[in-house]
């Protein structure tokens, strides 16, 4: 904390300008009026204050606004945002998307910091849901943002927001998250025709159930192996050899390279070897001819 000393004669700041970069910390504390700083916050970011000087300016704002800064000040924090703690940010009420964008811009190119995570949390909670414009903004700055949310948090994403999602935004999502997002995507894209629909829904298919995969297999979609490998194992297992062949189209040849990996490995174990042989890929591990397959789970359900 900078000790309180009187401002030297002639150094009282009449406006926030470049001359202040020559002030020592104690001079900033003594000579810059907090109310002046608050009204001219938009100038601070353009002035190359050192991080130590920014500490002093933050201290002045903290004294002026002990209950949290007003949005008019928050919007113009610029580099001063980097000095804020999550505790500081929890006192804020950020409602404007422009404010959110301005602060995310300061942190651009860096990992999501605890400050940014807190800011986003405050913003989204204030809005009540992740609307399209917010999601657009967040994924533009942090492509992995969507996958950092819990399934519960994702449930507040309206289907209309799904249009903002790009394939790379889902790269780090796990199956639990895709289970929540897939039905929303299906709803969002329901009015599109076959090929366009597949292009849009493709990145969400890790949450698709068996019946939807069967339906896709009837539409000549030619799913690539990378997408197939991300499908839920439990959704792939009931598919027949013919259905997988239709689903993958010319990409079916890629199954050979993936035969030891899930879900291909588990799917192979469920197919008749005769049927697998029809693919001509040399896939091994299917059920030998003449063997009877009992579905014990079905038997238990009946008894």
């Amino acid at each position: 904390e900078v000790e309180k000393t009187a401002c030297p004669s002639g150094k009282k700041a009449r406006e926030i300008d470049e001359s202040l970069i020559f002030y020592k910390k104690w001079e900033l504390e003594a000579c810059v009026d907090a109310a002046l700083l608050a009204t001219q916050m938009d100038r601070v970011n353009a002035i190359p204050f050192t991080y130590e000087q920014l500490d002093v300016l933050k201290h002045k704002l903290d004294e002026l606004y002990p209950q949290g800064y007003p949005e008019s000040v928050i919007q113009h924090l610029g580099y001063l945002f980097l000095k804020m703690s999550p505790e500081d940010i929890r006192k804020w009420n950020v409602t404007s998307l422009e404010t959110l964008k301005a602060l995310l811009e300061v942190n651009k190119g860096h990992e999501m910091s605890p400050q940014v995570a807190t800011l986003i949390d405050r913003f989204v909670k204030g809005r009540g849901q992740l609307d399209k414009d917010t999601l657009d903004t967040l994924t533009a700055f942090y492509p992995g943002y969507l996958c950092s949310l819990s399934p519960e948090e994702l449930s507040s994403v309206p289907p209309s927001s799904i249009w903002a999602v790009r394939p790379q935004d889902l790269d780090t999502c796990d199956p639990r998250q895709l289970d929540v997002l897939y039905p929303k995507a299906r709803l969002a894209f329901q009015n599109m025709n076959g090929s366009e629909y597949f292009v849009k829904i493709q990145s969400f298919l890790g949450g698709a159930p068996t019946e939807d995969l069967k339906a896709l297999s009837q539409q000549n979609v030619s799913m690539d192996l990378a997408t197939f490998m991300k499908l839920r194992t439990d959704a792939v297992l009931p598919l027949t050899v013919a259905e997988v062949q239709k689903l993958l189209g010319p990409h079916v040849e890629g199954l050979k390279a993936e035969e030891r990996h899930r879900p291909v490995r588990d799917w192979i174990l469920r197919q008749r070897q005769d049927d697998l042989d029809t693919l001509g890929l040399g896939l091994q591990g299917g059920i030998p001819n003449g063997y009877l397959v009992l579905d014990l789970s079905m038997q238990e359900a009946l008894s």
């Epitope: 970069i21 190359p48 204050f49 050192t50 991080y51 130590e52 000087q53 920014l54 580099y79």
Partner: nanobody
Framework: EVQIVESGGGSVQAGETLRLSCTAS????????MGWYRQAPGDECELVST???????NYADSVKGRFTISQDNAKNTVYLQMTSLKPEDTAIYSC?????????WGQGTLVTVS
């Protein structure tokens, strides 16, 4: 990687002259505003002088009329010509891009005026 090397410091008598040099690499020098900072023993960091990419200069009140900042873009070097030195100019002098917002940090070059 941004690298900055300051040199030219030393011990002099009051009233004498020194010229500090700061050679930089790892960034576009002629697009950058540069500054000389100093920190005296037991005191806090202070900005002494700045030079912007267009060549305009600014000085702290305490050195106006005695210090001159200049740059040679071809050599990626900023200079601080210090005349009429006083004992209160004794400090470690550091050179920085203003955009770094770091101030007094790193090696610097020591100037001692007796």
């Amino acid at each position: 990687e941004v690298q900055i090397v300051e040199s030219g410091g030393g011990s002099v008598q009051a009233g004498e002259t020194l010229r500090l040099s700061c050679t930089a690499s790892g960034f576009t020098f002629d697009d950058s505003d540069m500054g000389w900072y100093r920190q005296a023993p037991g005191d806090e960091c202070e900005l002494v002088s700045t030079i912007s990419s267009d060549g305009s200069t600014n000085y702290a009140d305490s050195v106006k009329g005695r210090f001159t900042i200049s740059q040679d873009n071809a050599k990626n070097t900023v200079y601080l010509q210090m005349t009429s030195l006083k004992p209160e100019d004794t400090a470690i002098y550091s050179c920085r891009t203003m955009a770094s917002r770091i101030g007094c940090w790193g090696q610097g070059t020591l100037v001692t005026v007796s």
